[in-house]
């Protein structure tokens, strides 16, 4: 089995607890991989306001993950 490592995670720190739904353009979920040992939820903000990492343990992140998984499977 490949070793999981933290070094190449996309997010730094725990992430924000919530983002205003009205500000969300897109949500992307990165599952644990060889590059990063944790799930990451990346929010793309509207109006070119960049991206934010959402704390994967937050209520909002759990809802987003559930929604995406329902859509994909």
């Amino acid at each position: 089995f490949p070793m999981f490592k933290r070094g190449r995670c996309l997010c730094i720190g725990p992430g924000v607890k919530a983002v205003k739904v009205a500000d969300i353009e897109k949500a992307s979920i990165m599952y644990p991989s060889n590059n990063c040992d944790k799930i990451e939820v990346i929010i793309t903000l509207k109006e070119n306001k960049g991206q934010r990492c959402l704390n994967p343990k937050s209520k909002q992140a759990r809802l987003i993950i559930k929604k995406v998984e329902r859509k994909n499977f």
Epitope: C9, G13, G50
Partner: nanobody, 126 residues
Framework: EVQLVESGGGLVQAGGSLRLSCAAS????????IGWFRQAPGKEREGVSL????????YYADSVKGRFTISSDNAKNTVYLQMNSLKPEDTAVYYC???????????????????WGQGTQVTVSS
């Protein structure tokens, strides 16, 4: 009220050392990434180093790698920047900043940070 207060700047000769401190208050320290930036006269503010208090991960700009060390004391809500082998080109006002939800891609983007200190002057003479 959120506050970031830098201290430890001063005048030092080339090759010398300084330790900067950034004392944070008014927010949950563990939720934030603390970054050090600097701005030399007539230049843009640039990222120097950052630390995530939650897991201790650290990042450095190439220009300071091997010379500067960032650390944090979570009990004191304080981040330190130990600067060794200082060069005249390190002369600048040094600022600490707090950001949340940062991506590596944007880690030294000024706009990614929510709170800023007032800065402390570092002057390195040759």
């Amino acid at each position: 009220e959120v506050q970031l207060v830098e201290s430890g700047g001063g005048l030092v000769q080339a090759g010398g050392s300084l330790r900067l401190s950034c004392a944070a208050s008014g927010f949950s320290f563990d939720d934030y990434v603390i970054g050090w930036f600097r701005q030399a006269p007539g230049k843009e503010r640039e990222g120097v180093s950052l630390i995530s208090s939650s897991d201790g991960s650290t990042y450095y700009a190439d220009s300071v790698k091997g010379r500067f060390t960032i650390s944090s004391d979570n009990a004191k809500n304080t981040v330190y920047l130990q600067m060794n082998s200082l060069k005249p080109e390190d002369t600048a006002v040094y600022y600490c900043a707090a950001g949340n939800g940062l991506l590596r891609l944007w880690m030294f983007h000024v706009s990614a940070y929510d709170y800023w200190g007032q800065g402390t002057q570092v002057t390195v003479s040759s």
